[in-house]
Amino acid sequence: CDLPQTHSLGSRRTLMLLAQMRRISLFSCLKDRHDFGFPQEEFGNQFQKAETIPVLHEMIQQIFNLFSTKDSSAAWDETLLDKFYTELYQQLNDLEACVIQGVGVTETPLMKEDSILAVRKYFQRITLYLKEKKYSPCAWEVVRAEIMRSFSLSTNLQESLRSKE
């Protein structure tokens, strides 16, 4: 399954929107930073394209879920948030098209499930952190910065997959 060129453009736009969403400076929140344990190994280059597509899909789905909560709507600029949803939705569609094609359905399903579970647990840690910090502006800024970082890492994987073709 070939992801369209627009997919990587969409990823870049998503990162740009995340950058623009910043409301306060991370500098004033240095003490609030937290190691969420991004499962970088689940996005390692050793995986085949067939295995990474569902993991990438899970990552973007979780980002979508995180930013479409009531608490998120209160934290961010509505216009930027709407544009952000649109970009994520388009990327989910691109990835779903690949998943539907049944790429790699029979290939190492257990490995894939473990990776998806690791991504889910990562987002559970982020959700718990926000809850513990009572969805404060600093907590949201820390999460925004973390999502930019992890999304960028997963985007880099998409690019490396494309270049291997």
Epitope: M16, Q20, R23
Partner: antibody, heavy 123, light 107 residues
Framework: QVQLVQSGAEVKKPGASVKVSCKAS????????INWVRQAPGQGLEWIGM????????SAAQTFQGRVTMTRDTSTSTVYMELSSLRSEDTAVYYC????????????????WGQGTTVTVSS | DIQMTQSPSSLSASVGDRVTITCRAS??????LNWYQQKPGKAPKLLIY???SLQSGVPSRFSGSGSGTDFTLTISSLQPEDFATYYC?????????FGGGTKVEIK
Amino acid sequence: QVQLVQSGAEVKKPGASVKVSCKASGYSFTSYDINWVRQAPGQGLEWIGMINPSSGFTSAAQTFQGRVTMTRDTSTSTVYMELSSLRSEDTAVYYCATIKGLGAYYYYGMDVWGQGTTVTVSS
Amino acid sequence: DIQMTQSPSSLSASVGDRVTITCRASQSIDRYLNWYQQKPGKAPKLLIYAASSLQSGVPSRFSGSGSGTDFTLTISSLQPEDFATYYCQQSYSPPLTFGGGTKVEIK
């Protein structure tokens, strides 16, 4: 590409003020903090302070509080650092630096630097 | 303020040598430590962030380790272009503070 371009060298008399500019290009100006760091001749690096170009929020090291003013002009993507009541010890190269890389941003490592502005304070 | 102490303040080494620079924080800073390289008349360059993450475009001969109060920058095989001054910087809490620097000179 991401660039920070600073204003030229300045020579000032003790007691005067100096205003150094730093023009950003190649990225979304309001999305990343800009820091100011100085280096006296033959000495190490010293953090002066930072500004959030979006909100104008600033924070300065205690050593400079009351003497430093950091401002920004979003229309020209430029930040300014003004240091008043200059003394000979303020003779240094002044750098502006931003944090653009995503990992670096989280760990607040300055990954893009201006070329530096030499400020000489002499009577 | 958090004090950052670097050692040694200077060292002489030859091309191909393994070089180690240490940085100690006056209190625990977790892994919020960055390393910079600076050459005469030039702006500093970020080498490593988060104690051990290599900044994009930096050669893999540079590596960082440590957490808490003790950190190390290692150059596995010194190259002619590596002769410079190296600084550590903490980003754990404001104000940001730098180590005094370590000058790496040609033996």
